[in-house]
């Protein structure tokens, strides 16, 4: 009889442990759902506020045609500049035409005056060829005016209305570029 009672007690205890485990799993699941919900709401709010603002470029970016430009307020070496742009979902400026160059240099004159700004141009150490960051070659009129006498890696920058070259490890401002959002209206 005593053995029967202790067996029943053990079974009840086992059932209780299973229920506790199930409750714990449910609580964990509920917490996970709440967290997912929070992320979802944040995402929706971001999307809605973006749609509501419907500005083709983010705040503090300049628009020209299909592009948005960000002129940095900090100095960094070329590689760090590249990473700073990536954090904003953009790349270092790639100048496609004389018109774009004129727009950039005109805007810089208005904003900051005659400083140095890294762009997404670098010189291949082996061939000496200048290439944009996507691997394309600059048009002949958009090659840096002077060849830097540096044993280190050489990168391109804009100053006044010229494209120049310098050791990539020097500190300069930088310009990021991304596509402007198309208006859906």
């Amino acid at each position: 009889k005593l053995l029967q009672v202790s067996t029943i007690a053990m079974q009840q205890q086992e059932k209780l442990i299973q229920q506790e485990r199930a409750l714990l799993n449910f609580t964990e699941w509920k917490r996970s759902c709440a967290l997912q919900m929070k992320y979802c709401q944040a995402f929706m709010q971001n999307s809605l506020s973006s749609a509501h603002n419907s500005s083709p470029c983010p705040n503090n970016w300049i628009q020209n045609r299909e592009s948005c430009y960000y002129v940095s307020e900090i100095w960094s070496i070329w590689h760090t500049s590249q990473e700073n742009c990536l954090k904003e979902g953009s790349t270092l400026l790639q100048i496609e035409s004389k018109e774009e160059m004129d727009f950039i240099t005109g805007s810089l004159r208005k904003i900051k005056g005659s400083y140095d700004y890294w762009v997404g141009l670098s010189q291949d150490g082996h061939s000496g060829r200048w290439l944009w960051q996507d691997g394309s070659s600059p048009s002949p009129g958009l090659l840096p005016a002077e060849r830097s006498q540096s044993a280190n890696q050489v990168c391109g920058y804009v100053k006044s209305n010229s494209l120049l070259s310098s050791n990539c490890s020097t500190w300069k401002y930088f310009i990021c570029e991304k596509y402007a959002l198309r208006s859906s209206v």
């Epitope: 995402f43 990473e83 990536l86 954090k87 979902g89 790349t91 691997g135 991304k178």
Partner: nanobody
Framework: DVQLVESGGGLVQPGGSLRLSCAAS????????MGWYRQAPGKQRELVAA???????TYADSVKGRFTISRDNAKNTVYLQMNSLRPEDTAVYYC?????????WGQGTLVTVSS
């Protein structure tokens, strides 16, 4: 947080090809760009290639014309197609997610180019 899982590394002969994959999960809406870095023994970690959410790529000089970065938004995956591999491409390749705040790294996948 953002979790990143790399795959596709291995041993390949000089001149051969490999395709690396990096699958992202978690708070992926905060990610603005994805990139591949590499670190060879005794060297600093360097950016190999990256791609923004808008699909704009960027490459290191040493891999231009040989490597191609791409992304599949439906699968939340970024790929690095590596062609004409050289012994100097041997390294651990890491995937990185760029956000305005923290940056997130994968655990790395080893690529060995040797005959």
């Amino acid at each position: 947080d953002v979790q990143l899982v790399e795959s596709g590394g291995g041993l390949v002969q000089p001149g051969g090809s490999l395709r690396l994959s990096c699958a992202a999960s978690g708070r992926i809406f905060s990610v603005n760009a994805m990139g591949w870095y590499r670190q060879a023994p005794g060297k600093q970690r360097e950016l190999v290639a990256a791609i923004t959410n808008q699909g704009a790529p960027t490459y290191a000089d040493s891999v231009k014309g040989r490597f191609t970065i791409s992304r599949d938004n439906a699968k939340n995956t970024v790929y690095l197609q590596m062609n004409s591999l050289r012994p100097e491409d041997t390294a651990v390749y890491y995937c990185k997610a760029f956000t305005r705040g923290d940056d997130y790294w994968g655990q790395g996948t080893l690529v060995t180019v040797s005959s």
